[in-house]
Interface confidence: low
């Protein structure tokens, strides 16, 4: 019994589960004797293209009687006056009905498959009686908002007499305009009466910005007596039939608006009809834009003829509805605005895959954006552009798949054809707050596949740790480290050299666990890039990064400069990122600048080597990163601290030296091999690098549309890391406290200072 009830319910409610993807005109209006053409849209899947299409009339009791179908059936009511044509390549079919009568008025469905299965769209057809016109009536049919010119002939005897135009309101004619200068208030500012030259026995009345209320019967008259000349006119003002637009969810739509040269210099707008007659401005040429369309709309520049187009990307369900474009000095719909109309249907059975609409990154970090494209167009050129809201919105190109990269983005932006098969990847690193905004993915092929992604810059620090800009020496070997936290343990780590067509993979060495992450276990990694026999061609940007298969995650960039060997005292490693933007929080200032002192002398970093070479201290050559001495890597007996320097000086120098060294957490030391030097870099500032957690973009973010790669949620980590247990962040000590602690440490060790200083630096 229950089964029977369920079966009945399914029969009665065939389409309650999903919204039908079939779409057509909700209302069709025509006049007796005329023809109509009704277009119905369907998702052009293989099954839909080949299935039966039908047009049926809904009965009072809910059934739907087929009148015509794609399988050749034509009802006797339609014989000889109707046809149905399928256009499978467009996903449309068209029903043409001629010789309409008022009997054709009613409720219909256009649909696919079986009449009762719900894959259909309801259409209301209204056939009205033609106007009962007086003899000799001239009919003017004009679109809403346009201009009409009513011509009124007269005879010579009335040439000098008053000319007038009346409108029939009910039984009475109401004066609209006359040649003595009268203008009816309803027509003020939009009507004029022109009397042609004496040779032509004709006067004209021109009405602009036609309103629906202007429709009706008019009478023009020359003279006021029984000899006057009269002419009847019937003005029909047409509300524009909306053009049906059927687009996929997440896709893109373009409204082409051609209102004519007469409004070329008038402000243009696109609005969306809400309840009643209200039409909310979506965008206009006066700079207004609805917040719901921020980042995903462009009003393309007008042509000389006043035509323009509006592009909307990232279509949402709520974007469906009726849109009007028009021209009016206020930049919004007013009575008498010339308009064009569209009915937008957003197909939820979209062919466009879900992709993150928001991607998050941290200052100094990176994002990897996945962009869908029509897989049938794998050879199309892929583009990425930055949406700008100024004026009417524009989207300047940043990168394309043919190797063009905007100059300001060189070294930090790459468009990769991977993973392919309908998706390409854009990687942007060295992020700053200025990179926040909306970006569009598009191709030179299917314009419906334009998608929008918003990049947000959030609090936190990058996951990958690399030195700043590095200087290599011609002919020698360069080793550049990249530190990967343990959260990336299961991902492929790589180094590559950036160029404008991508990033060419390079061999790299896994050098075991990294000491850069104090709260990380053995799964962290230090992966080094080694360049042997450096040449000029090695100069450029290098990226280290993580990926899984063809899906890319975080990247970090290092610029390698190449210079010739210099004499002693020359530059060792350039670790200060000179070209960082002012607000660029690249890693941490402690690492980018190494506190301007942290690599004063490698010996300071040996566990207990607290005293520096007095000669070096004396001649002030330790003021900056770049001025390290290259003469004495092995340390030397010249540091005769115990015998040549008074103990007070030893204590003072030691306190400063150890203050710097200890403040950098001596144990967290890593080594970069550059030239013949050994430069030890404190990595202490790298702990808790994701205090506020940034999105790693390996897949997507934990935002509006979440996806993750291979189910590995730790790659997303928008707000916290799921694989690391973080130590509570230590409060930063003041420099005074650091100095005091260092001094205490130094006193405890002072008994061994002299001997160890003479032994030279040992490895940390």
């Amino acid at each position: 019994m229950l089964l029977f009830v369920l079966t009945c319910l399914l029969a009665v409610f065939p389409a309650i589960s999903t919204k039908s993807p079939i779409f057509g005109p909700e209302e069709v209006n025509s006049v007796e004797g005329n023809s109509v053409s009704i277009t119905c849209y369907y998702p052009p899947t293989s099954v839909n293209r080949h299935t039966r299409k039908y047009w049926c009339r809904q009965g009072a009791r809910g059934g739907c009687i087929t009148l015509i179908s794609s399988e050749g059936y034509v009802s006797s009511k339609y014989a000889g006056r109707a046809n149905l044509t399928n256009f499978p390549e467009n996903g449309t079919f068209v029903v043409n009905i001629a010789q309409l009568s008022q009997d054709d008025s009613g409720r219909y469905k256009c649909g696919l498959g079986i009449n009762s299965r719900g894959l259909s769209f309801d259409v209301s057809l209204e056939v009205s009686q033609g106007p009962g016109l007086l003899n000799d009536t001239k009919v003017y049919t004009v679109d809403l908002g346009r201009t009409v010119t009513i011509n009124c002939p007269f005879k010579t005897e009335n040439a000098q007499k008053r000319k007038s135009l009346y409108k029939q309101i009910g039984l009475y004619p109401v004066l609209v305009i006359d040649s003595s200068g009268y203008v009816n208030p309803n027509y003020t500012g939009r009507i004029r009466l022109d009397i042609q030259g004496t040779g032509q026995l004709l006067f004209s009345v021109v009405i602009n910005q036609l309103r629906l209320s202007d429709a009706g019967q008019y009478l023009c008259q020359a003279g006021d007596d029984s000899n006057s000349n009269k002419k009847n006119a019937d003005l029909q003002v047409l509300k524009p039939e909306p053009e049906l637009v059927y687009e996929d969810l997440r896709g893109s739509v373009t409204f082409h608006c051609a209102l004519g040269p007469e409004v070329a210099n008038v402000a243009k707008f696109l609005c969306r009809q809400s309840s009643g007659e209200n039409c909310d401005v979506v965008v206009n040429t006066l700079g207004k834009r609805a917040p719901a369309f921020e980042g995903r709309i462009l009003l393309n520049p007008q042509d000389k003829d006043g035509s323009f187009s509006v592009v909307i990307t990232g279509l949402r369900k709520e974007d469906a509805g009726r849109y009007l474009c028009g021209a009016h000095s206020d930049g919004q719909l007013q009575e008498g605005s010339p308009i064009q109309a569209w009915q937008l249907f957003v197909n939820e059975e979209s062919t466009i895959p879900r992709s993150p609409t928001v991607v998050k990154g941290v200052a100094g970090g990176s994002v990897a954006v996945l962009c869908p494209y029509n897989r049938k167009e794998s050879k199309s050129i892929k583009y990425w552009c930055l949406w700008e809201g100024a004026q009417n919105g524009r989207c300047p190109l940043l990168v394309d798949s043919e190797g063009w990269v905007k100059a300001q983005y060189e070294g930090r932006l790459s468009l990769l054809e991977e993973p392919g098969n309908g998706t390409f990847t854009v990687i942007l690193n060295q992020l700053t707050s200025r990179d926040a905004g909306f970006y569009w993915c598009l191709t030179n092929g299917d314009t419906l596949w334009r998608t929008t992604v918003e990049i947000k810059i959030i609090e936190g620090e990058p996951n990958l740790k690399v030195p700043g800009n590095v200087t290599a020496v011609l002919g020698e070997t360069l080793k550049v480290p990249c530190h990967f936290p343990c959260k990336f343990s299961s991902y492929e780590k790589y180094w590559c050299k950036w160029n404008n067509t991508g990033c060419q993979a390079l061999p790299s060495q896994d050098e075991g666990p990294s000491k850069a992450f104090v709260n990380c276990d053995e799964n962290s990694r230090l992966v080094s890039l080694t360049l042997n026999l450096v040449t000029r061609a090695d100069e450029g940007w290098y990226w280290c990064g993580v990926k899984q298969g063809h899906f890319y995650g975080e990247t970090a960039a290092v610029y390698v400069a190449v210079e010739e060997r210099k004499a002693a005292g020359s530059r060792d490693v350039s670790l200060a990122k000179a070209d960082a933007a002012p607000d660029e929080k690249v890693l941490d200032s402690g690492f980018r600048e190494i506190e301007n002192k942290a690599i004063q002398d490698p010996r300071l970093f040996a566990e207990e080597k607290a005293v520096a070479d007095t000669r070096d201290q004396a001649d002030g050559s330790r003021a900056s990163v770049d001025s390290g001495s290259s003469e004495e890597q092995g340390g030397s007996s010249r540091a005769l601290v115990s015998t040549l320097v008074p103990l007070g000086l030893v204590l003072a120098v030691g306190a400063v030296a150890v203050g710097v060294a200890r403040a950098r957490h001596r144990k967290n030391v890593d080594r970069v091999s550059i030239r013949s030097y050994r430069t030890d870099i404190s990595m202490s500032d790298f702990e808790n690098s994701r205090e506020f957690g940034a999105n790693d973009n390996m897949g997507a973010s934990s935002i509006t549309q979440e996806t993750s790669l291979g189910g590995k949620e730790e790659f997303v980590a928008t707000t916290e890391s799921t694989t690391e247990t973080k130590e509570p962040k230590k409060a930063k000590r003041s420099s005074k406290e650091e100095a005091e602690m260092a001094y205490k440490d130094f006193l405890l060790q002072s008994s061994t200072v002299a001997a160890e200083a003479q032994d030279g630096p040992q490895e940390a």
């Epitope: 393309n300 520049p301 050129i381 524009r394 989207c395 190109l397 063009w404 598009l442 030179n444 334009r450």
Partner: nanobody, 119 residues
Framework: QVQLVESGGGLAQAGGSLTLSCAAS????????MGWYRQTPGNSREFVAR???????HYADSVTGRFTLSRTQDKNTVSLQMNSLKPDDTGVYYC?????????????WGQGTQVTVSS
């Protein structure tokens, strides 16, 4: 609309030189990229060289160092100087102009000019 008129194709010996020219007319002011593509026997149309509105030039790997693309001051004519020609360079060369409309690109093509390199 943009109209493209190509000239300068012809026959050359391997190792020789040819210069192709392409003049744009119509709404040429909006052109973002101008360049050359070629269709060699049995292959689909492939990129050769192009110059962007900011004067950045790109070349296909196969022609780098042999071909040079330049543009007149008014930016409406591009010339492709082809040196050290190889038989593999034989094909129909098409001039291309691309306009970035702010939301998509529109490509315009010339009729094509034949280049034949004999060994």
């Amino acid at each position: 609309q943009v109209q493209l008129v190509e000239s300068g194709g012809g026959l050359a010996q391997a190792g020789g030189s040819l210069t192709l020219s392409c003049a744009a007319s119509g709404t040429a002011a909006g052109i973002d990229v101008m360049g050359w593509y070629r269709q060699t026997p049995g292959n689909s149309r492939e990129f050769v060289a192009r110059i962007f509105s900011n004067d950045v030039t790109h070349y296909a790997d196969s022609v780098t160092g042999r071909f040079t693309l330049s543009r007149t001051q008014d930016k409406n004519t591009v010339s492709l100087q082809m040196n050290s020609l190889k038989p593999d360079d034989t094909g129909v060369y098409y001039c291309n102009a691309r306009i970035w409309t702010g939301s998509t690109t529109v490509d315009y093509w010339g009729q094509g000019t034949q280049v034949t390199v004999s060994s």
